[in-house]
């Protein structure tokens, strides 16, 4: 796997341990927590990143669930089970044998149960809505400039194919970025929208996963964009299955 050869680090994932023990003395990097080899030329999967994060725990921040089918990561951090490809396993359990089903971004999509709970497949999150509120600026951002800057960001920083950025909406002070990626659209080597959204979320929170970088500070035509709050909504190809009690709570 590629990494910075000179000092053997992983540019796309600072939560790794790297050493020149790959084939021919090449730099190889393994994710903290799981020990899995990662490809440093692209984003690391969210599952491996969460696992690495749990090896150095921090306080979880939580978001708000706005509607019946849109999921938000209300449960915060947990130590996930990842498959050999680094994807979330459909069923996740904690150390007290409480289990639940998750989607492809690792967000719980069923009520919690016991070890008998079955999760037949990993349901894909095909639509992600990133909702940002920015602080007052010198004036409203020009919509097309904002659109271009955010598309550039996802293309260059997160290596997400432009076709997966479905839309950028703007009604001052709210910015919405829509990411869409169906199972059939995602080719081998394509960055997953869930991974791109997670890197973006961590960047906005000033916890960049990239090696040697601080948080992400955006500017549009020179104008500083200071984010006041971020909410991320996840929509799955199959609607989540929660009891009526949860839906009316």
């Amino acid at each position: 796997h590629t990494a910075a050869q000179d000092n053997c680090t992983c540019p796309t994932n600072k939560m790794t341990v790297c050493s020149p023990d790959g084939p021919g003395g090449r730099c190889q990097c393994r994710a903290l927590g799981s020990g899995m080899a990662v490809d440093c030329s692209t984003l690391t999967s969210k599952c491996l990143l969460l696992k690495a994060r749990m090896s150095a725990p921090k306080n979880a921040r939580t978001l708000v669930r706005p509607s019946e089918h849109a999921l938000v990561d209300n449960d915060g951090l947990y130590d996930p089970d990842c498959d050999p490809e680094g994807r979330f396993k459909a069923r996740q359990c904690n150390q007290t044998s409480v289990c639940w089903c998750v989607n492809s971004v690792g967000v719980r999509r069923t009520d919690k149960g016991d070890l008998s709970l079955r999760c037949d497949e990993l349901v894909r999150t095909h639509h992600i809505l990133i909702d940002l509120r920015h602080r007052p600026t010198a004036g409203a951002f020009n919509h097309s400039d904002l659109d271009a800057e955010l598309r550039r960001l996802f293309r260059e920083r997160y290596r997400l194919h432009p076709k997966f950025v479905a839309a950028v909406h703007y009604e001052q002070p709210t910015i919405q970025i829509e990411l869409r990626q169906n199972t059939s659209q995602k080719a081998a080597g394509d960055v997953d929208i869930g991974d791109a959204a997670y890197y973006f979320e961590r960047d906005i929170k000033g916890e960049s996963l990239f090696q040697g970088r601080g948080g992400l500070d955006l500017r549009v035509r020179g104008e500083p964009l200071q984010v006041e709050r971020t909410l991320i909504y996840y929509l799955d190809e199959i609607p989540p299955k929660f009891s009526m009690k949860r839906l009316t709570a």
């Epitope: 004036g139 916890e207 970088r213 948080g215 500017r219 104008e223 006041e228």
Partner: antibody, heavy 119, light 106 residues
């Protein structure tokens, strides 16, 4: 290399106005805002506001709204800060500064302009 | 407005000492914190941004840490040219500075 060069020291009477200039060079002027920061003797640095030379949009610290006016001139790549109704409290060093290329911290600063208000 | 409180306001140290300055924000600033060094009659100089990222050309004896509301600047081995005043600055919600910490020769 990036440079911000400010106008010289000024001595003003109470009630007067002062206009400080900041000439930018070594980068594309419209790519970054220009911040203005004030430092009164023995005091902390105080952000006054910024101007975006791209569209002349301004954002001010509430404390300086109506007190300071920020302008810029693209043709001469110069930013200006005018303070009106000067009092002894406005005696300070005034700095212009440019943001860091990847954050909103300030990495290039002018040399500062000392404004003294005295009767 | 976000308030930034630095401590101590001044300290005396010798060359070779390890020096630690702390900065507390009145609310979470999500690592949007910069540290500056200022010498008498000079403009501030950016040392670190993003709480931990060292500005190009700044010696590695300077380091930053912290998260949430609490941040620290550490000078691992004080050098003669490090005697100055240090300011923290948040840039999460507009821009505000700490009151400064003067590092003097013991």
């Amino acid at each position: 290399q990036v440079q911000l060069v400010q106008s010289g020291a000024e001595v003003k009477k109470p009630g007067a106005s002062v206009k400080v200039s900041c000439k930018a060079s070594g980068y594309t002027f419209t790519t970054y805002v220009i911040h203005w920061v004030r430092q009164a003797p023995g005091q902390r640095l105080e952000w006054m506001g910024y101007i975006n030379p791209n569209n002349d949009g301004t954002k001010y610290n509430e404390k300086f709204k109506g007190k300071a006016t920020l302008t810029s001139d693209k043709s001469s790549t110069t930013a200006y800060m005018e303070v009106r109704g000067l009092t002894s409290e406005d005696s300070a060093v005034y700095y212009c500064a440019r943001p860091h290329f990847e954050t909103h911290a300030m990495d290039y600063w002018g040399q500062g302009t000392l404004v003294t208000v005295s009767s | 407005d976000i308030q930034m409180t630095q401590s101590p306001s001044s300290l005396s140290a010798s060359v070779g000492d390890r020096v630690t300055i702390t900065c507390k924000a009145s609310e979470d600033i999500f690592n949007r914190l910069a540290w500056y060094q200022q010498k008498p009659g000079k403009a501030p100089k950016l040392l670190l941004y993003g709480a931990t990222s060292l500005e190009t050309g700044v010696p590695s004896r300077f380091s930053g840490s912290g998260s949430g509301t609490d941040y620290t600047l550490t000078i691992s081995s004080l050098q003669p040219e490090d005697f100055a005043t240090y300011y923290c600055q948040q840039y999460w919600n507009t821009w505000t500075f700490g009151q400064g910490t003067k590092v003097e020769i013991k």
